[in-house]
């Protein structure tokens, strides 16, 4: 008799990453009987929601439902109908919503309420929408990359199944850059974490991890740019801001009201004699770098050592995966190769920023001008943050791996978040019997 193909015994999960600049929906899949195995969950789909981040919908909450429709319908198509009702859906909002909540809990609640109502209309098992903490964002990013890199597996392999994998079980640090915040998370070497707020303890697959994490709110690339503009316009003699972080020939008008809309620029707020000002690019990497450094207060440190703004940072240890905007920006600039030294990156940035705006527009005709115009700033900011902010050096630069995906799954906090909420990372190492992978003692 011919064997009939058995239906696939798989499970699905959906996580929406409601970031400051956009929302992305991720669909994950795993074999039902191997839930506790490490490395079995993988991403089957990413859907980027068209439009800005959810915090921008304060004045138009009635549009949130339509905004989410395309990606939720995509999820309906990708996941078999028979699985819809048991597929959990989680939405985690990050720094953009933390900033909105800082301004007004009412407005943040209103946005989340409408998001929840919209997501509840789908046939999935909606588990709620919430603003995750910066600590969670860092921790889940760290769990994601180490899960995907096989660092939690106790089986040592003589071959490498994923890039960047050294055979040892030493975990990778995680460097995450968003639009409104940036996170640094790693296991320090025998170092006391002097600040309790930055300490996390995990027991994963039978092993204890003492993890350092910090989320720098307002130091994502977009909010850092707003900070820099607010700082620099203070000393401008008129409504022209000659800005070294934009290409020569670039011009853009900025409303002062937009500049002071975010809590991130509060410390630079002042009464200006104009309602608008014009950015005029002069394209100078060195000057741009110097201007960015003024955003990092390194004069005050109440600990043995700090990153910036008085935040404790232990000595860097091991390899790091740099993902999200760290990766997207460096990928655009063609600087993600392991062979490119920090000195070479700096040289390339100097050349890139000095290129005239008209030339840049021609070379990258397919890229939206809004994004294209900011790569000089973003690239310079990444270098400044990693070198002066986190104290990487020309030598330790080679320990930074710019990662987009690992084994087909995006690096980011969403996978770690789902693994945690679905209890798929056991504290103890599961023991498999010789008979079956699905039976645990």
């Amino acid at each position: 008799t011919q064997n009939k193909a058995l239906p696939e015994n798989v499970k699905y999960g959906i996580v929406l990453d409601a970031g400051s600049s956009h929302t992305s929906l991720y669909i994950y899949k795993w074999p039902a009987e191997k839930e506790n195995d490490t490395g079995v969950v993988h991403q089957v789909e990413e859907c980027r929601v068209k439009g800005p981040g959810i915090s921008k919908f304060v004045q138009k909450v009635n549009e949130i439902g339509i905004y989410l429709t395309d990606c939720m319908e995509r999820a309906r198509e990708v996941i078999p109908r028979s699985q819809h009702q048991e597929t959990p859906v989680y939405l985690g909002a990050t720094a953009g919503m933390r900033l909105l909540r800082m301004e007004s809990e009412e407005l943040a609640d209103r946005v989340l309420d409408v998001v929840e109502r919209s997501l509840s209309n789908y046939p999935f098992d909606f588990q709620g929408a919430r603003i995750i903490t910066g600590q969670e964002e860092g921790a889940y990013g760290w769990i994601t990359i180490n899960y995907l890199l096989g660092k939690f597996s106790q089986k040592t392999r003589w071959f490498s199944i994923v890039p960047y994998e050294t055979n040892n079980q030493e975990t990778f640090g995680a460097l995450d850059l968003g639009g409104a915040s940036t996170q640094v998370t790693f296991v320090p070497q025998n170092q006391t974490i002097e600040s309790p707020d930055n300490a996390l303890q995990f027991r994963l697959y039978g092993k204890d991890y003492n993890v350092y994490t910090h989320s720098f709110l307002c130091y994502g690339k977009d909010q850092a740019l707003w900070q820099k503009l607010a700082k620099d316009i203070q000393v401008a003699s008129n409504e022209i801001l000659r800005d070294p972080c934009f290409h020569p020939g670039y011009k853009k008008v900025v409303n002062v009201s937009d500049l002071y809309k975010t809590p991130c620029t509060k410390r630079f707020e002042m009464t200006l004699p104009f309602q608008q000002f014009e950015i005029q690019g002069i394209g100078n990497y060195q000057q741009c770098h110097q201007s960015i450094l003024e955003l990092f207060n390194t004069s005050y440190c109440p600990y043995s050592q700090c990153a910036f703004n008085g935040i404790f940072l232990p000595p860097l240890q091991g390899d790091f995966g740099a993902f999200s905007a760290f990766y997207f920006v460096m990928k655009f600039l063609n600087l993600t190769s392991e062979k490119v030294s920090q000195e070479k990156v700096t040289e390339m940035m100097k050349k890139f920023c000095a290129q005239p705006w008209e030339e840049i527009k021609t070379s990258y005709a397919g890229v939206k001008e809004k994004y294209l115009s900011e790569y000089c700033f973003s690239g310079t900011y990444i270098l400044s943050l990693l070198l002066q902010g986190y104290h990487f050096t020309a030598d330790s630069w080679e320990h930074i791996h710019f990662i987009g995906k690992i084994q087909g799954s995006d690096a980011g906090w969403t996978l770690g978040y789902m693994l945690n909420l679905t209890n798929m990372i056991p504290a103890e190492q599961p023991l498999s019997t010789p008979l079956s992978h699905s039976t645990y003692v």
Epitope: V58, Q59, V61, R98, R101, M102, E103, S104, E105, E106, L107, A108, D109, R110, T133, G134, Q135, D197, L217, C218, P263, C264, T265, K266, R267, F268, E269
Partner: antibody, heavy 116, light 111 residues
Framework: QVQLVQSGAEVKKPGASVKVSCKAS????????MHWVRQAPGQRLEWIGY????????TFSQKFQGRATITVDTSASTAYMELSSLRSEDTAVYYC?????????WGQGTLVTVSS | DIVMTQSPDSLAVSLGERATINCRAS??????????MYWYQQKPGQPPKLLIY???NQGSGVPDRFSGSGSGTDFTLTISSLQAEDVAVYYC?????????FGGGTKVEIK
């Protein structure tokens, strides 16, 4: 759980300054603004101003502009409110309160008495 | 500045009866579809306690007998069935714009 613990009562002479502290715990200190509100005996509550602990930016009621200063020590999760050039009408209970627009958590209050 | 006017100044209500306090703002405290109106309860020697936020939402741990209503400039706090522990001064507050302002307070007593 969220807690705001303020410093003890103060007695000051007219013209002097007072600095009241508010130690926060149970949440990420830099994720929420800290407001200061006062209440003179038998009077309504009066908003003084607030600080963004994230970066130290502050905003004041016009009435207190130039006389009140709000600062933070993020490593100690503590906010401070200093009021200078004290006069007898500044005798009041001073409160810190956490929030953007919703003051859900308040300190226990600090009585400041201004008397010659 | 937005002026908040509360009425009455004091109110004596029998146990189990309804108490109603009004608050009028000198201009609308609504923005983006939200009323930036709050009600607080204050007992002697204690800090204010948030009862109602966004005009009609109950604060954490607040008994169901407390409810808020209204929008724009006119708002009401209702205690549906007054209990002995509700004796206090009640304040309304707006946070639509700086300076954030409070009403003069309403003292609630038992008749």
């Amino acid at each position: 759980q969220v807690q705001l613990v303020q410093s003890g009562a103060e007695v000051k002479k007219p013209g002097a300054s007072v600095k009241v502290s508010c130690k926060a715990s149970g949440y990420t200190f830099t994720d929420y603004n800290m407001h200061w509100v006062r209440q003179a005996p038998g009077q309504r509550l009066e908003w003084i101003g607030y600080i963004v602990p994230l970066n130290g930016g502050s905003t004041f009621s016009q009435k207190f502009q130039g006389r009140a200063t709000i600062t933070v020590d993020t490593s100690a999760s503590t906010a401070y409110m200093e009021l200078s050039s004290l006069r007898s009408e500044d005798t009041a209970v001073y409160y810190c309160a956490r929030g953007g627009t919703r003051f859900a958590y308040w300190g226990q209050g600090t009585l400041v008495t201004v008397s010659s | 500045d937005i002026v908040m006017t509360q009425s009455p100044d004091s109110l004596a209500v029998s146990l189990g009866e309804r108490a109603t306090i009004n608050c009028r703002a000198s201009e609308s405290v609504d923005n983006f579809g939200v009323s930036f109106m709050y009600w607080y309860q204050q007992k002697p020697g204690q800090p204010p306690k948030l009862l109602i936020y966004g005009a009609s939402n109950q604060g954490s741990g607040v008994p169901d007998r407390f409810s808020g209503s209204g929008s724009g400039t006119d708002f009401t706090l209702t205690i549906s069935s007054l209990q002995a522990e509700d004796v206090a001064v009640y304040y309304c507050q707006q946070t639509k714009e700086v300076p954030y302002t409070f009403g003069g307070g309403t003292k609630v007593e038992i008749k």
